[in-house]
């Protein structure tokens, strides 16, 4: 590390005094202090001499020594004073340029150090300094105002109490530059917009910044619009609006609008599209099927998109049958907008009962007349079975009848024992029929269907079962002769989902 | 005052039918639906179907295969029977009167135990 | 099936304190959704249904919120008699319940 003589930190002297310092290091030194008349320098290899022999008080500051070749980089410093009566201060720049946030240093040097205790800031005119300024003072630097805002942008003096009286330095000019964290910040209104020939619009550009330098524009399909410009400054930023004002669109005032802001940070643009239409439009629509089928006791979602212009003036959810007159109930639809012109149309229908199978139909009106969309609901049901004993043509024959939705399959089973199920180890045959006979079929109800097993002998010791299954689940019926005549054993096991 | 009540044997050998009876007062079983659920001990509470007003039935799949749900309205009775019973379905059975979204009232419970 | 999924299992608050219970669908069921007390050795007894209706003669510090997956039971000042388990179910389908949370007093 470099040595400097005479080895104090702080030297004091008068004007016109000679001063010498002398730096001393291994290799090559070099010296750095403020800009000042009257040295000279003179530099014998590894020792460099600073002298002056007429110090004024412009000599105030601090000298540093550093030896270049140090890898350490280390160095030596020595602060001058050139108490001069008439000139406190030695001010070093008379502009300073800080950014937001930044410690602004006013580099007012104190020529005598005995002065200290009664130093203060103000600002040019004998102002006070503004509310929450926050500073702090060293003699060897001056004051430095700490996180400096925009406000503070102000021209200051350093005062020092001489004899009883305030003497000032000369003014110095503080620059706080807003910190710009990057392009203007734009909104552009509407989103989207929809209008019907020879209707008015209004499209609103705006761009704000915390920096009053920026440009805004609009552009209708990459053409550039002259618009006047309404400038404004609150919530400290300043805005630029752009309201472009049509009184009847017509189909040439259609496509994309853009908004262009920018700065030193860089540019940001949002679009929006204007659509002019030749009439009112209603358009319904949905991403399910408009056929749905669903088990019985599950819940379902009817949901409906609907684009509009203008804006609805009615919708409701109606069921059209078959079964009971009811009606959905309010508290189960919803409706959700997810912008101006789409909405969505919900109706909700938790554990779905046999009656609400049928028709729903979403209706809703705008000046463009009215709309409809229509579901449809079909309910699954696993079988239910029943087996009676008839005749038929003189022939014994046992009859089961199934119903459920969609049309359950019919298989009989004949098996050793009584029992109110056939189990494998019991079966002694199996007959499918692939075709029975359909006794029902309409729309939203179940379909019932009807199997004839003839027998022209019933085994006493054996039951007939009767199994109908559909993607739904299953359901069988067990018929047991005994020799007073027949017996029927109803679905214990009555459903099954495989 | 709207009450239901169960009625149930306690006690069930394993691969036998369970028969419980749900008597209801304060209401009428045509006007509303009636579920049945029961709470075992390592499940939490478990719907196992539901009697409509009008009489039709929805079940849980899994009990689909052994559980009939039926009622009597004149005597404001409805019943339960699973059949072919194992240990875990050992719990408590609440009737329970369904309001389609909620269940409002809630029976006291019988509670069945199935062991040999 | 849709399942229920209810936090904590189990939780042990003060008197007069706030207290919070969870309710995860593991699919959108609307505000289908109840919630039951169940004192020991009692049935169930009905507290909020359609996710925010607090039931005839339920003290109003019982609040239920939330829709389609994510649902709570709020207690905003907890009563000696509160000491319950609480369960949530849904009956946007097939009805299922959560597992319970058990609500002890310190």
């Known amino acids: 590390i470099p040595v400097i003589e005479p080895s104090v930190p702080e030297l004091v002297v008068k004007p016109g005094a000679t001063v010498t310092l002398r730096c001393v290091g291994n290799g090559s030194v070099e010296w750095d202090g403020p800009p000042s008349p009257h040295w000279t320098l003179y530099s014998d290899g590894s020792s460099s001499i600073l002298s002056t022999n007429n110090a004024t008080f412009q000599n105030t500051g601090t000298y540093r020594c550093t030896e270049p070749g140090d890898p350490l980089g280390g160095s030596a410093a020595i602060h001058l004073y050139v108490k001069d009566p008439a000139r406190p201060w030695n001010v070093l720049a008379q502009e300073v340029v800080v950014f937001e946030d930044q410690d602004a240093l006013l580099p007012c040097l104190l020529t005598d150090p005995v002065l200290e205790a009664g130093v203060s800031l103000v600002r040019v005119r004998g102002r006070p300094l503004m509310r929450h300024t926050n500073y702090s003072f060293s003699p060897w630097h001056g004051f430095t105002i700490h996180r400096a805002k925009f406000i503070q942008s102000q021209d200051y003096q350093c005062s020092a109490l001489m004899g009883g009286r305030k003497v000032m330095s000369i003014s110095i000019r503080l620059k706080v530059q807003k910190v710009i964290p990057g392009p203007p910040a734009l909104t552009l209104v509407p989103a989207e917009l929809v209008r019907i020939r020879g209707e008015a619009a209004q499209i609103v550009c705006s761009a704000s910044s915390v920096d009053v330098n920026f440009d805004v524009f609009l552009q209708h399909n990459n053409t550039k619009l002259a618009i006047p410009q309404q400038s404004d400054f609150h919530n400290n930023r300043y805005q630029k609006v752009l309201t472009l004002n049509l009184d009847q669109v017509d189909f040439q005032h259609a496509g994309n609008y853009s908004c262009v802001a920018s700065n030193v940070q860089g540019k940001h643009s949002t679009s929006m599209f204007f659509r002019v239409v030749e009439s009112a439009y209603l358009n319904l629509s949905s991403e399910q099927n408009l056929i749905q089928e669903v088990t019985v006791g599950e819940g379902l979602n009817l949901k409906v998109m609907v684009e509009a212009y203008p804006g609805l003036q009615g919708f409701n959810w109606t069921y059209l049958g078959p079964f009971s007159d009811h009606q959905p109930e309010p508290k189960l639809a919803n409706a959700t907008t997810k912008d101006t012109y789409r909405h969505t149309f919900t109706l909700s229908l938790p554990r779905l009962k046999p009656s609400e199978a049928g028709r729903y139909s979403f209706l809703a009106r705008n000046p463009g007349g009215w709309r409809a969309l229509t579901f449809e609901l079909t309910l699954r049901y696993p079988p239910e079975v029943s087996v009676i004993w008839t005749f038929i043509n003189g022939s014994g024959t046992l009859l089961c009848a199934a119903s459920g939705y969609p049309q359950p399959n019919v298989t009989w089973l004949q098996c050793s024992g009584h029992t109110d199920r056939c189990d494998e180890a019991q079966v002694l045959q199996v007959w499918d029929d692939p075709y029975p006979e359909v006794l029902s079929q309409e729309p939203f109800h179940k379909v019932t269907v009807q199997s004839l097993l003839t027998v022209e002998t019933l085994e006493h010791n054996q039951t007939y079962e009767c199994r109908a299954h559909n993607s739904v689940g299953s359901g069988s019926w067990a018929f047991i002769p005994i020799s007073a005549g027949a017996h029927t054993h109803p679905p214990d096991e009555f459903l099954f989902t495989p | 005052r709207v009450q239901l009540k169960e009625s149930g044997p306690g006690l069930v050998a394993p691969s036998q039918s369970l028969s419980i009876t749900c008597t209801v007062s304060?209401?009428?079983?045509?006007?509303?639906?009636i579920s049945w659920i029961r709470q075992s001990p390592g499940k939490g509470l478990e719907w196992l179907g539901v009697?409509?007003?009008?009489?039709?039935?929805n079940y849980n799949s899994p009990f689909m295969s052994r559980l009939r749900i039926s009622k009597d309205d004149s005597r404001s009775q409805v019943f339960l029977k699973v059949n072919r019973l194992q240990t875990d379905d050992t719990a408590i059975y609440y009737c329970?009167?369904?309001?389609?979204?909620?269940?409002?009232?809630w029976g006291a419970g019988t509670t069945v135990t199935v062991s040999s | 099936k849709i399942v229920m999924t209810q936090s904590p299992k189990s939780m042990s608050v003060s008197v007069g304190e706030r207290v919070s219970l969870s309710c995860k669908a593991s699919?959108?069921?609307?505000?289908?959704v109840s919630w039951y007390q169940q004192k020991p050795e009692q049935s169930p007894k009905l507290l909020i249904y359609?996710?925010?209706n607090r039931y005839t003669g339920v003290p109003d510090r019982f609040t239920g919120s939330g829709s389609a997956t994510d649902f709570t039971l709020t207690i905003s000042s907890v009563q000696a008699e509160d000491l319950a388990d609480y369960s949530c179910?849904?009956?946007?389908?097939?009805?299922?319940f959560g597992t319970g949370t058990k609500l002890e007093i310190k």
């Open positions: 329970v009167r369904d309001l389609r979204l909620y269940f409002d009232v």
């Open positions: 304060g209401f009428s079983l045509t006007s509303y639906d």
């Open positions: 009697i409509w007003s009008g009489g039709g039935t």
């Open positions: 699919e959108d069921v609307g505000t289908y």
């Open positions: 359609g996710s925010s």
């Open positions: 179910g849904q009956s946007f389908t097939y009805p299922t």
